[in-house]
Interface confidence: low
Amino acid sequence: EEELQMIQPEKLLLVTVGKTATLHCTVTSLLPVGPVLWFRGVGPGRELIYNQKEGHFPRVTTVSDLTKRNNMDFSIRISSITPADVGTYYCVKFRKGSPENVEFKSGPGTEMALGAKPSAPVVLGPAARTTPEHTVSFTCESHGFSPRDITLKWFKNGNELSDFQTNVDPTGQSVAYSIRSTARVVLDPWDVRSQVICEVAHVTLQGDPLRGTANLSEAIRVPPTLEVTQQPMRVGNQVNVTCQVRKFYPQSLQLTWSENGNVCQRETASTLTENKDGTYNWTSWFLVNISDQRDDVVLTCQVKHDGQLAVSKRLALEVTVHQKDQSSDATP
């Protein structure tokens, strides 16, 4: 006859408040005849959790049909878990006796502990915008989880990042833990539409990690490039000059025209367009009056982008029969 073994496979069972916990217990033999009961704790003060024969246990259900004679699975489910339910649970075999059943063998026990889910990760970017090719830091925080073991990953547009540092606090025993991670991200010119994602995986999340995101559009400044050109056609004594401000972000931009150093209020027309990468283009047209009596005209297109130092481009118009375009490098 095979010796009866009481098998409780899980040493530790992590559960979350409000969920259902399954406590497994199987036996290797049907003998001796008698019931299997569940207790929490050991000794005379132990608490009866489930007895198929008698008592009401509204939160407890059995996994198998205990009325079947050949049943060897005495696992139970406990619903609506609360913090008061933590402890070590034992399935215990009794042999029939008179006047009472007699305890025969106990399983090794399963400790039920509360696992707390981490809070939704919060990702914070830099306080100020930075230009491409520079490195910016993003922080990710999640709190209130237990146990301490947790996995955090960073992604940029779906590509996993490797340059980050993570800390879990406190280092010792605690009811709940927090995680903080800082990732260093190199900005690319096309990152206006990019995202960084912080992904947190924890045993309580059952394989469905939590994610926090931040848009790089809030961290990046793409400075504009300027080009001033003179239109070849001339209408009477007017020449059309164009200032093209390309590939900038964010949209915040001030453009002013100067004629021979004097700021002009007039601007014939302007258009703003958005590029596929999220940056903007701004085109401004300026009509210059040219008369034979005038000296050479120097036009300046000055752009102040996102509160940064102004950049400008100059164009010299020679008032001759054959006008000649001439432009210089950008000046601060």
Epitope: H56, P58, R59, T61, T62, V63, D65, L66, S79
Partner: antibody, heavy 120, light 107 residues
Framework: QVQLVQSGAEVKKPGASVKVSCKAS????????ISWVRQAPGQGLEWMGW????????NYAQKLQGRVTMTTDTSTSTAYMELRSLRSDDTAVYYC?????????????WGRGTLVTVSS | DIQMTQSPSSVSASVGDRVTITCRAS??????LAWYQQKPGKAPKLLIY???NLQSGVPSRFSGSGSGTDFTLTISSLQPEDFATYYC?????????FGGGTKVEIK
């Protein structure tokens, strides 16, 4: 779709027995307990008992102990409620209801009810 | 057994009114209370579970509150389809028990 379909109306004489069926579909029958609730004409709701197909667990209202038997057939996803020694005050609509599982004991899915009339 | 007492047994109200129904348990049941709506000839319908959680598909004008022994169901703005009988039910322990019901009638 998710539903509980109950058997049709019954007319019984005092002292007889009635067996009402409740067929579940659209969900895992063994995953949820079933309760039986009755309602006498013009009266409130009265819980009769509870059965969980997974383990065959039952729990009956004290006043019906000995007269009521709840069973399940997992092969057909059907729950049964048998009430014996019928009396005129057993005349009622009998409902089966699924225990929701999202909280303690509450019922998120109900059958349409079976009218049982006990009359001589 | 835990006794559940509902009040009032009936209430007359008009469309747009705020209606409050109370339920008292004879002993503490934590938050394990549900509210149901029943229309004539129909099965009950779960509105609120665990005292304050709105069942999926139920309009947000229904809300529940309370813990321990005293509970409330509130309909913030009564609609024509809300005229029905409402029951509370304790789910803390067997036997499960229901309140006597509150009939919400058209004024």
């Amino acid at each position: 779709q998710v539903q509980l379909v109950q058997s049709g109306a019954e007319v019984k004489k005092p002292g007889a027995s009635v067996k009402v069926s409740c067929k579940a579909s659209g969900y895992t029958f063994t995953g949820y307990p079933i309760s039986w609730v009755r309602q006498a004409p013009g009266q409130g709701l009265e819980w009769m008992g509870w059965i969980y197909a997974y383990g065959g667990n039952t729990n009956y209202a004290q006043k019906l102990q000995g007269r009521v038997t709840m069973t399940t057939d997992t092969s057909t996803s059907t729950a049964y409620m048998e009430l014996r020694s019928l009396r005129s005050d057993d005349t009622a609509v009998y409902y089966c209801a699924r225990e929701a599982g999202s909280s303690w004991y509450d019922f998120d899915l109900w059958g349409r009810g079976t009218l049982v009339t006990v009359s001589s | 057994d835990i006794q559940m007492t509902q009040s009032p047994s009936s209430v007359s109200a008009s469309v747009g009114d705020r209606v409050t129904i109370t339920c008292r348990a004879s002993q503490g049941i934590s938050s394990w209370l549900a509210w149901y709506q029943q229309k004539p000839g129909k099965a009950p319908k779960l509105l609120i579970y665990a005292a304050s959680n709105l069942q999926s598909g139920v309009p947000s004008r229904f809300s529940g509150s309370g813990s321990g022994t005293d509970f409330t169901l509130t309909i913030s703005s009564l609609q024509p389809e809300d005229f029905a009988t409402y029951y509370c039910q304790q789910g803390a322990s067997f036997p499960i028990t229901f309140g006597g019901g509150t009939k919400v009638e058209i004024k």
